[in-house]
């Protein structure tokens, strides 16, 4: 399945609209730091296919989609940015959506990556807990932000090397 | 508010299959993971597998494995477990638990759908 | 696959009474991922507590969890009559995930 030029060019729009969405300043929420473990390895393109790839992507789409779709996180960012962030994400869910069902459709498909879905639910939770922790504070969120920035490279960064491989 | 409503209860004879449907209302349908999980009477509960209504995929427990198929309709927002090769062992309640983080991890749960196996 | 084994089977106590139930995983279970729920007959199970120590919705202040690890705690501080049920244990941390085979509390 090869995912729409599109698609690439929502992923750049997604994560310049997390970048506009950055409200104070990085330095003053240092003492918030966390290490939330990115699980790298399960995007790093070559421990699996295409397809189960894919599913991984879809896997950390959907999760970032569910986390800025919560009243805590409307509360937290300015409505109209968040909004068109939301937007690419769901266009972007589209896409893989519509590639996962293609693969699905295929015999003899590999079976599904089911550890690294777990490493990507679980990287969520942690995010997740964290938020709870801090009461969903300002720098909390700031610094999830700058996290989910970050995880969103890694799964821009894997899809451009899904695509060499094409 | 989240809503799981779950098919009746079905008797089955030994080596036939039962299919048990979750109809799923209050959220977007196709975000969350639905888990099915079953209690036989008076045991505990078990994790038999989830599926994710957004693309289809499945993730079995390997006990189930080749015997549970898990398929949902998003027309519909329902999800279905179909367990084939019945035996006794597996009268059972079968219930459907809504994915998700934190505070939501199971926190829904659909009424329970009894299929009770016996010649 | 993680065995969660949850004692005692069975916790007879009277309204008013401490109950401590406890919940040991055959290997370690990263405390986040560690859940409990309560069943009372007839009932689908209904989330108490997540990530080990923290309190779902509803829940009230009386029940607290604790532990990490393998041994894993449910409090009830003070057993109000409607307390009185089967409750179990739950890990999300690895395939498959399990259940303990369930703590019955029943009144004394």
């Known amino acids: 399945c090869d995912l729409p030029q599109t698609h690439s060019l929502g992923n750049r729009r997604a994560l310049i609209l997390l970048a506009q969405m950055g409200r104070i300043s990085h330095f003053s929420c240092l003492k918030d730091r966390h290490d939330f473990g990115f699980p790298e390895e399960e995007f790093d393109g070559h421990q699996f296919q295409k397809a189960q790839a894919i599913s991984v992507l879809h896997e950390m789409i959907q999760q970032t989609f569910n986390l800025f779709s919560t009243e805590d996180s409307s509360a937290a960012w300015e409505q109209s940015l968040l909004e068109k962030f939301s937007t690419e994400l769901y266009q972007q869910l589209n896409d893989l959506e519509a590639c996962v069902i293609q693969e699905v459709g295929v015999e003899e498909t590999p079976l599904m990556n089911e550890d690294s879905i777990l490493a990507v639910r679980k990287y969520f939770q942690r995010i997740t807990l964290y938020l709870t922790e801090k009461k969903y504070s300002p720098c909390a969120w700031e610094v999830v932000r700058a996290e989910i920035m970050r995880s969103l490279s890694f799964s821009t960064n894997l899809q451009k090397r899904l695509r060499r491989k094409d | 508010q989240v809503q799981l409503v779950q098919s009746g209860a079905e008797v089955k004879k030994p080596g036939a299959s039962v299919k048990v449907s979750c109809k799923a209302s209050?959220?977007?349908?196709?975000?969350?993971?639905m888990h099915w999980v079953r209690q036989a009477p008076g045991q505990g509960l078990e994790w038999m597998g989830e599926?994710?209504?957004?693309?289809?995929?499945?993730i079995y427990a390997q006990k189930f494995q080749g015997r549970v198929t898990m398929t949902r309709d998003t027309s519909t927002s329902t999800v279905y477990m179909e367990l084939s090769s019945l035996r006794s062992e597996d009268t059972a309640v079968y219930y459907c638990?809504?994915?998700?983080?934190?505070?939501?991890?199971?926190?829904?749960w659909g009424q329970g759908t009894l299929v009770t196996v016996s010649s | 696959e993680i065995v969660l084994t949850q004692s005692p089977a069975t916790l007879s106590l009277s309204p008013g009474e401490r109950a401590t139930l406890s919940c040991s995983a055959g290997?370690?279970?990263?405390?986040?991922?560690l859940y409990w729920y309560q069943q009372k007959p007839g009932q689908a199970p209904r989330l108490l507590i997540y990530?080990?120590?923290n309190l779902a919705s509803g829940i009230p202040a009386r029940f607290s969890g604790s532990g990490s690890g393998t041994d894993f705690t449910l409090t009830i501080s003070s057993l109000e009559p409607e307390d009185f049920a089967v409750y179990y244990c739950?890990?999300?941390?690895?395939?498959?995930?399990?259940f303990g085979q369930g703590t019955k509390l029943e009144i004394k």
């Open positions: 209050g959220y977007t349908f196709t975000n969350y993971w």
């Open positions: 990530s080990t120590s």
């Open positions: 638990a809504r994915g998700g983080l934190g505070p939501a991890w199971f926190a829904y």
């Open positions: 599926i994710n209504p957004s693309h289809g995929r499945t």
């Open positions: 290997s370690s279970v990263d405390s986040s991922y």
């Open positions: 739950h890990q999300w941390s690895s395939y498959p995930f399990t």
